[in-house]
């Protein structure tokens, strides 16, 4: 059961592997899912010695771990790929790493672009 969740209809889209997977590289994604299932946005990235390499962004289907999260915040210490998810339109535009071990909070701001709409 849920109450007052932010409805997710659109997310920021990005795919670093867009050429190989034959998709758009970036834009907006309209989320579609089953009835009575919640929708989320997500972001995934790598951190190579402080250099952020965005992997993917987009819609994420019903996942309890994302329920009631208004911001996209990754908390795991040092995974191969950082992952965060959230609820609310375009909530994955900005994403943050807030490590448990008390390291600095790092927020990644998107560069100003004019995104295209994916259909």
């Amino acid at each position: 059961s849920g109450r007052g969740e932010a409805e997710t209809r659109e997310c920021i889209y990005y795919n670093a592997n867009w050429e190989l997977e034959r998709t758009n590289q970036s834009g907006l994604e309209r989320c579609e899912g089953e009835q009575d299932k919640r929708l989320h946005c997500y972001a995934s990235w790598r951190n190579s010695s402080g250099t952020i390499e965005l992997v993917k962004k987009g819609c994420w289907l019903d996942d309890f771990n994302c329920y009631d999260r208004q911001e996209c915040v990754a908390t795991e210490e040092n995974p191969q790929v950082y992952f965060c998810c959230c609820e609310g339109n375009f909530c994955n535009e900005r994403f943050t790493h807030l490590p448990e071990a008390g390291g600095p909070e790092v927020t990644y701001e998107p560069p100003p672009t004019a995104p295209t709409l994916l259909t």
Epitope: E5, F64, A74, E76, Y82
Partner: antibody
Framework: VQLVESGGGLVQPGGSLRLSCSAS????????MHWVRQAPGKGLEYVSA????????YYADSVKGRFTISRDNSKNTLYLQMNSLRAEDTAVYYC?????????????WGQGTMITVSS | DIQMTQSPSSVSASVGDRVTITCRAS??????LAWYQQKPGKAPKLLIY???NLQSGVPSRFSGSGSGTDFTLTINSLQPEDFATYFC?????????FGPGTKVEIK
Amino acid sequence: VQLVESGGGLVQPGGSLRLSCSASGFTFSSYAMHWVRQAPGKGLEYVSAISSNGGSTYYADSVKGRFTISRDNSKNTLYLQMNSLRAEDTAVYYCAKTYGGYGNAFDIWGQGTMITVSS
Amino acid sequence: DIQMTQSPSSVSASVGDRVTITCRASQGISRWLAWYQQKPGKAPKLLIYAASNLQSGVPSRFSGSGSGTDFTLTINSLQPEDFATYFCQQGKSFPYTFGPGTKVEIK
């Protein structure tokens, strides 16, 4: 990083108990939390979940309407209120933390607390 | 509900052996699968998440593979501390469900 359950014991059929799970060493309010049980000599059975801010909950059919999951993020504590207990609820009850990345796995478990329902 | 099955239910092996445990989901779960180790009287311990990702602090002799409905946990060069029961768990949809377990015993 640990979870410590308490509140287990012997209770008569139809009785009530409240289990507590005290968390330390991680940002409790950032994670969905879960209860899983294991009957003596049996496998693991999923019981209940609560989202990071307590706004969403889930119950397995076997406990729906009898058990209530809740949390107090200011006290870093997870609860399971168990009413109308039955013999088949006899089990070790574990609280577990969701792994913060992708996959909906449980990376931290409590030591478990035993509930025996018997007359 | 998604049903999880495991095979074998038990396996006898010696230190140094390679042990393979399989887990099958009743419907596709993509890579939403975790593996746990449990010893008597103890809580389960996460070994593998998202089908093939090794949890921090878990020895590299453990590995996972698979996607969809069929998954495998492999223990290369079994060590004395690896004798335990192993469970798979799907995290694709509620209720999250566990396999019945595979007991790895000393031959």
